[in-house]
């Protein structure tokens, strides 16, 4: 979801303000409460799940949660698309779905989650720790990818939700912070609104800031699986074919995770019908790419009539994999 | 000019295989997949399966596992289909197509190759 | 597997004349349907993809339409060329399925 994080133009402080609550203090909630309300970001929940009838017969399930429209899911294994992963469905919710080995059968479950059934013989058949990515492009959030596997452990017909690779990484410690110091911030903004209630609000002047500039990209540990630590792309190394990466590296580059964390999940939007998708309780393992804003000089893929896609930080081909886009 | 070209005719006796080839020109062959079509005599068309020259990826009609085995060579730009355990079912007109994933259909076929099954 | 069902096997023409080819889907594929010409003796050429985007090169007497179940292919000012046998397909789901193809005959 694209938010722009306007801080409005102040009128001077009526006179009675001064002090106390002084021009710099005034600033400071406006920030914080644009940062606060702005924070949503999408995400995308992946579940695997080992058939009990056939043992070596998986079902992925992936499902975006976000209020934007989706252009294109790829699904991959052995880590994420562009990144050593090996692409096993490209669906697109007007123009059909291209699968393959051992893909048995992708749909679409919903208007934002699929599923895609994996058969199990044969040499380039899924075992217990393999991992799953799903990666979504859509409008106008960009490309966001999470990846699971069904932990060894797992008991067959049972729902095994992925849980987090045990790898923390460096970027990680930091967007932590910046979401400890945000949701500080957004505490220290409730107190001061609690503190000042009773004085007037004050007048706010059209901002002269442009509309269209972009606010930074953000990434955080959801709501929407609490309990969960979501680490991105930190799989878990499989013996499977095809090998996986012990560590798949976020494809945004290191300036895209320098920016804000947030805190608010987004439920799926559109009609009822599409919207009984069930989230998995704690097992998501969440991670997201954004490839939203194209760089300078940078042009978009031809996509035809009718498809959206945007700029991959990776270039042009990165959305399909290995179903080439020219 | 983007061209596919398949091999000539085959006639073949019940039981043994044929292989079908289809050489690309014109475009960068790793860049689209290569599909394959049955057309029987004065009969619709069927899709056998698909094939990613980039990684080998496959996927089969369930119809033709067993029957049909796609494989390409990169170094050649070509793409092979073989059918095996042939019976006169398989009498046919084979074509490869290739898959315009930017806008997924089939944009461009081959002409044929004419496979015919007989003792 | 989704059936793609052309109820009319022939359907004959004149020259200037406009015709509508239709095709049905048994379940719901979208806009995931393409259209397919085919003369005598020759392969198949694409003339419509995703229910109504013309092939390049494809003369504007050729439209497409439909989504869902139902999908239209229209030639207005019908052609001598014309001639040749029209086929749709489905890419909405895996294996794909072309219907049995429609046959126009110039009168």
């Known amino acids: 979801m694209r938010t722009e994080a306007q801080v409005p133009a102040l009128q001077p402080p009526e006179p009675g303000l001064e002090g106390a609550m002084g021009h710099r203090t005034l600033v400071l909630p406006w920030v914080l409460l644009t940062l606060c309300v702005t924070a949503g970001t999408p995400e995308v929940w992946v579940q695997v799940r080992m058939e009990a009838t056939e043992l070596s017969s998986f079902t992925i399930r992936c499902g975006f949660l976000g209020s934007g429209s989706i252009s294109l899911v790829t699904v991959s294994w052995g880590g994420p698309n562009g990144a050593g992963g090996t692409t096993l469905a490209v669906l697109h919710p007007e123009r059909g779905i291209r699968q393959w080995a051992p893909a048995r059968q992708a749909r679409w479950e919903t208007q934002s989650s699929i599923s895609l059934i994996l058969e199990g013989s044969g040499a380039s058949s899924p075992c217990a720790n393999t991992t799953f990515c799903c990666k979504f492009a859509s409008f106008p959030e960009g490309s966001w990818e999470a990846c699971g596997s069904l932990p060894p452990s797992s008991d067959p017909g049972l729902s095994a939700p992925p849980t987090p690779a045990p790898i923390l990484r460096a970027d990680l410690a930091g967007i932590l912070g910046v979401s400890g110091v945000l949701l500080f911030g957004c505490v220290y903004l409730l107190h001061l609104l609690r503190r000042h209630k009773h004085r007037p609000a004050p007048r706010l002047q059209p901002s002269r800031t442009s509309p269209q500039a972009p606010r930074a990209r953000a990434w955080a540990p959801s709501q929407a699986s609490q309990a969960a630590l979501h680490v991105p792309y930190a799989t878990i190394n499989t013996s499977c074919r095809p090998a996986t990466l012990d560590t798949a590296h976020p494809h945004g580059g290191p300036s895209w995770w320098a920016s804000l964390p947030t805190h608010a999940a987004h439920r799926p939007q559109g009609p009822a019908a599409w919207a009984s998708t069930p989230i998995p309780a704690r097992g998501s393992f969440v991670s997201v790419e954004n490839g939203l804003y194209a760089q300078a000089g940078e042009r978009p893929p031809h996509t035809g009539p009718g498809l959206t896609l945007f700029p991959d930080p990776r270039g042009p081909r990165a959305m399909e994999g290995p179903l080439g886009v020219r | 000019e983007v061209q596919l070209q398949q091999s000539g005719p085959e006639l073949a006796k019940p039981g043994s295989s044929v292989k079908i080839s289809c050489k690309a020109s014109?475009?960068?062959?790793?860049?689209?997949?290569i599909d394959w079509v049955k057309q029987s005599h004065g009969k619709s068309l069927e899709w056998i399966g698909a094939i990613d020259p980039n990684n080998d990826s496959t996927n089969y009609n369930q119809k033709f596992k067993g029957k049909a085995t796609l494989t390409v060579d990169k170094s050649s730009s070509t793409a092979y289909m073989e059918l095996r355990s042939l019976t006169s079912e398989d009498s046919a007109v084979y074509y490869c197509?290739?898959?315009?994933?930017?806008?997924?259909?089939?944009?461009?076929w081959a002409t044929g190759t004419t496979v015919t099954v007989s003792s | 597997d989704i059936v793609m069902t052309q109820s009319q096997k022939f359907m004959s023409t004149s020259v200037g004349d406009r015709v509508s080819i239709t095709c049905k889907a048994s379940?719901?594929?979208?806009?995931?349907v393409d259209w397919y010409q085919q003369k005598p003796g020759q392969s198949p050429k694409a003339l419509i993809f995703?229910?109504?985007n013309r092939h390049t090169g494809v003369p504007d007497r050729f439209t497409g339409s439909g989504s869902g179940t139902d999908f239209t292919l229209t030639i207005r000012n019908v052609q001598s060329e014309d001639l040749a046998d029209y086929f749709c397909l489905q890419h909405w789901n895996s294996p794909y399925t072309f219907g049995g193809g429609t046959k126009l005959e110039i009168r």
């Open positions: 197509t290739r898959w315009d994933s930017d806008d997924w259909y089939f944009d461009v």
């Open positions: 995703s229910s109504s």
């Open positions: 379940q719901n594929v979208r806009s995931a």
């Open positions: 014109g475009y960068t062959f790793t860049d689209y997949n």
